[in-house]
């Protein structure tokens, strides 16, 4: 009998609010034995795969997806999924990346550390949940983000 795969988690380093032009790294985590991690974007058809999987702990593996210079187009929700033979896991929750115009003000922090999305209950209608519906980019208060239509 195939094992039940735990849902992956996703986090962002150094955080989920990133100044334009700065770097961000998405960290996807799953159990030991993962062959491929995939990073997907809500409403986008593009994705990234990696088989560069490292062991984060005795029971966890992880993969890192780095964006060297964040632009407005990188804003929006991201999620992870992994392949542990012979099957794919469920998807992680979405993690929203916000891209901030550099204001130069000393009072506002550049990032929000410790942002992550961990496992929650999978929606029951899984046959229609592979990709979230299309969304449009919005600019508000010098933050680039995506508005959800749920």
């Amino acid at each position: 009998q195939e094992e039940d795969l735990p849902r992956p988690s996703i986090s962002a380093e150094p955080g989920t609010v990133i100044p334009l032009g700065s770097h961000v790294t998405f960290v996807c985590r799953g159990p030991v034995g993962v062959q491929t991690f995939r990073l997907e974007r809500e409403s986008r058809s593009t994705y990234n795969d990696t088989e560069d999987v490292s062991q984060a702990s005795p029971s966890e593996s992880e993969a890192r997806f780095r964006i060297d210079s964040v632009s407005e187009g990188n804003a929006g929700p991201y999620r992870c999924i992994y392949y542990k033979p012979p099957k794919w896991s469920e998807q992680s929750d979405y993690l929203e990346l916000l891209v901030k115009e550099t204001s130069g003000g000393p009072d506002s922090p550049d990032t929000e550390p410790g942002s992550s999305a961990g496992p929650t209950q999978r929606p029951s209608d899984n046959s229609h949940n592979e990709h979230a519906p299309a969304s449009q980019g919005l600019k508000a208060e010098h933050l680039y983000h995506h508005h959800h239509h749920h």
Epitope: T36, S45, T46, D49, Y83, H131, A132, P133, A134
Partner: antibody, heavy 117, light 111 residues
Amino acid sequence: EQSVEESGGRLVTPGTPLTLTCTASGFSLYKYNIQWVRQAPGKGLEYIGASTYAGYTYYASWAIGRVTISRTSTTVDLKMTSPTTEDTATYFCARHIDGDYSGYALWGPGTLVTISS
Amino acid sequence: ELDLTQTPASVSAAVGGTVTIKCQASQSIDTWFGWYQQKPGQSPKLLIYGASKLASGVPPRFKGSGSGTEFTLTISDLECADAATYYCQNTYYGVRYLGGAFGGGTEVEIK
């Protein structure tokens, strides 16, 4: 070299179940969506359905109950449960492009299915 | 399920000229959209994916644009080899399943 190839097309009588197979070579099928498309003689392309990398299966509304799509580690099958003469066509399978689900860059040569009494 | 309306059904243009093909979707599909070229007796060939990205090996004379519900394929500096039938396809797999419908095709004749 990466390729997909359809097989199983032949002449059958109406109502005879028929299974077509899409075989992947040179790449890991588990990473990809595979779609089935058909083309009746002299007509346009018609989407039948798809098997996604994560194991979801989608069908065109007209195909629900008429076909079943399933996959193994190296193949994606299209089973025609009770074909009619209107199902006579060349059947193609195709794989989506690396890094983007929106386009299908790898197509097989097609397999001809003829339904006739 | 989504419908794609492709126009025109056929078009004739001279070598060196330009052809524009349009596809209209009945619902928004963002940029989950592709354009294909098919010649008689051959399998379809991907030209454009993501509504505007050029597939590998396709010359930049082929240009895709649009998003949401309106999409356009423009072929410039037409060559004899461009004579073919062109199809658009919705590839959106979402919370609302919108199918993978193709447009009806546009037959391009080169004079």
